[in-house]
Each structure stands twice: as structure tokens, then as C-alpha cells.
């Protein structure tokens, strides 16, 4: 079938980086500036993506491949092929339609992107809060209250004895 097609359709011989020019007896013409064709046999070239505004050029457009964009510092990519840029916030904040807003009490965000998430509820696992949470950090859960009652055995085993003169690594 491929052999038959190439005999019948001269356009199938046009390689990537060219297009089959109907205005010139279907000869293979190079893609014009700022356009590309990534596969052979195309009747038109596609317009190159322009990385402007918040978008930065990660890879220049060539006659055979589209430009690739990423986001300027302070923003991060979203979507396939970095189709969108979303602004970063500080840790302890989340992005809303009103801009970057501090996490509400009881929630945290330890990244520059994403939403504020509730602190871990230690009591659900039968544990107690060892270190309080902040806007930037989750709580640290410790041993259960029963483990801390008088007479209970130590939660952490004693550290192994070290040879004299050796400092901890």
C-alpha cells in the first residue's frame, strides 16, 4: 500500500521540514520562516509557538519541530507541553483568584504551589502532637498519650554506646 501511495501521491515523498506545495505542481517546498512540519507528506506547515510574556523559550522552533516554552521565574508550568503558567506563592500561602493568601489556621502549604492542606489529626492514629503545625509545616505526631504515662517504657531505645573519642556522625 505504501508503495502504491507514493506512486499515486507525490506529496508522500515530502520530508519533515517541507510541505507539498499545490501552487507549484506539488513539489516539496521548505517551510517558511516561523513555521514547521514534524512529519513527512504534509500539505501545510504549522505556525511556530511563540513564547512571550510569562512564557520563556526553552527550545527554539526549527523547520521540523515546534518551539517549547517554560515559565519565567516566579511561575510554574501547568498543562501538557506547558500550555499555561501559574504564579508561585510563598510557602504558607495558596493562590486564589484574589492573589496569594496565607493559609488559614489549621492548614499548611510547604510548597510554592498548590493549596493549603489540613494539619494531620494525630489523634486519629491514637498519637499526640509532638511539634505544633504552622502555615508552612504540618504537625509532627509523636507517641500516643498512653506511651507517655508515668511508668511506661521509653519510646525510643537508648542510643548504642560509642567508643570514647568518637563524635556522632
Amino acid at each position: 500500500f505504501e508503495r502504491t501511495r507514493s506512486l499515486q501521491d507525490p506529496c508522500s515523498n515530502c520530508p519533515a521540514g517541507t510541505f507539498c506545495d499545490n501552487n507549484r505542481n506539488q513539489i516539496c517546498s521548505p517551510c517558511p520562516p516561523n513555521s514547521f512540519s514534524s512529519a513527512g507528506g504534509q500539505r501545510t506547515c504549522d505556525i511556530c509557538r511563540q513564547c512571550k510574556g510569562v512564557f520563556r523559550t526553552r527550545k527554539e522552533c526549527s523547520s521540523t519541530s515546534n518551539a517549547e516554552c517554560d515559565c519565567t521565574p516566579g511561575f510554574h508550568c501547568l498543562g501538557a507541553g506547558c500550555s499555561m503558567c501559574e504564579q508561585d506563592c510563598k510557602q504558607g500561602q495558596e493562590l486564589t483568584k484574589k492573589g496569594c493568601k496565607d493559609c488559614c489556621f489549621g492548614t499548611f502549604n510547604d510548597q510554592k504551589r498548590g493549596i493549603c492542606r489540613p494539619w494531620t489529626n494525630c489523634s486519629l492514629d491514637g498519637k499526640s502532637v509532638l511539634v505544633n503545625g504552622t502555615k508552612e509545616r504540618d504537625v509532627v505526631c509523636g507517641p500516643s498519650p498512653a506511651d507517655l504515662s508515668p511508668g511506661a517504657s521509653s519510646v525510643t531505645p537508648p542510643a548504642p554506646a560509642r567508643e570514647p573519642g568518637h563524635s556522632p556522625q
Epitope: L78, G79, S83, M84, C85, E86, Q87, L95
Partner: nanobody
Framework: EVQLVESGGGLVQPGGSLRLSCGAS????????MLWFRQAPGKGLEWVAN????????YYVDSVKGRFTISRDNAKNSLSLQMNSLRAEDTATYYC????????????????WGQGTTVTVSS
């Protein structure tokens, strides 16, 4: 081709006013959130204001609240930023941008930007 083109920038004295415009083409303007960002010389991009599809929701960065007003005319496919009581710190290149599909529901990303228009506030 999807396009945004800003205009209206220029030199203005402190306390003065300026109105920026952004013309949209190649997409159904009335179905997208629209935003203004700015970039002061040597600084990063800063979000300034945004407006929802029908203009009923508008939000601003604290530093421009009460001085700047964002508006849109869906019949004319245009976005505006009225800037009053301008200060030296408002000197920047101003960009209009389109909120991507799903903006405010699942993300706050932008997908189309203009080339920018420069505002200089100086005496």
C-alpha cells in the same frame, strides 16, 4: 490566531492618570477570565488585577486597590485598566493575559499574553 495587543502606555507625572487597553482576537473573549500583570525594571512579574467573564468579579493586588480599576467590554473584545493617582513605583511594563480554560475552578494559570505596554511615572 489567538492574540492580545496592549496599548495606552506612556510617560505620566506622579498623581496623574492613564488608561491601558488590551484588544483580543482569535477567541471567544466573553468566555475567559482576563488579567493584568506588570514587570518593573529589574523585578519579577507581578499580578495586578483580574476580572471574570461578565465583569461581576474583580480583584486587585493590595498596592493598587482604590487607584486602579479593571473593566471589560465583551462586545468590543477589549480589556481596560484605568490607573489613577499614579506613583513612581507603578513604573513597569504592563501585560494583559488570558486565564486558561478552567481558571478559578481548578487552577489560576494563564495561557495567552500580549507583548506589553510600558508605563513610566516620573516628574
Amino acid at each position: 490566531e489567538v492574540q492580545l495587543v496592549e496599548s495606552g502606555g506612556g510617560l505620566v507625572q506622579p498623581g496623574g492618570s492613564l488608561r491601558l487597553s488590551c484588544g483580543a482576537s482569535g477567541f471567544t473573549f466573553s468566555t475567559y477570565w482576563m488579567l493584568w500583570f506588570r514587570q518593573a525594571p529589574g523585578k519579577g512579574l507581578e499580578w495586578v488585577a483580574n476580572i471574570n467573564q461578565d465583569g461581576s468579579e474583580k480583584y486587585y493586588v493590595d498596592s493598587v486597590k482604590g487607584r486602579f480599576t479593571i473593566s471589560r467590554d465583551n462586545a468590543k473584545n477589549s480589556l481596560s485598566l484605568q490607573m489613577n493617582s499614579l506613583r513612581a513605583e507603578d513604573t513597569a511594563t504592563y501585560y494583559c493575559a488570558r486565564g486558561g480554560d478552567g481558571y478559578s475552578d481548578s487552577h489560576f494559570g494563564t495561557d495567552v499574553w500580549g507583548q506589553g505596554t510600558t508605563v513610566t511615572v516620573s516628574s
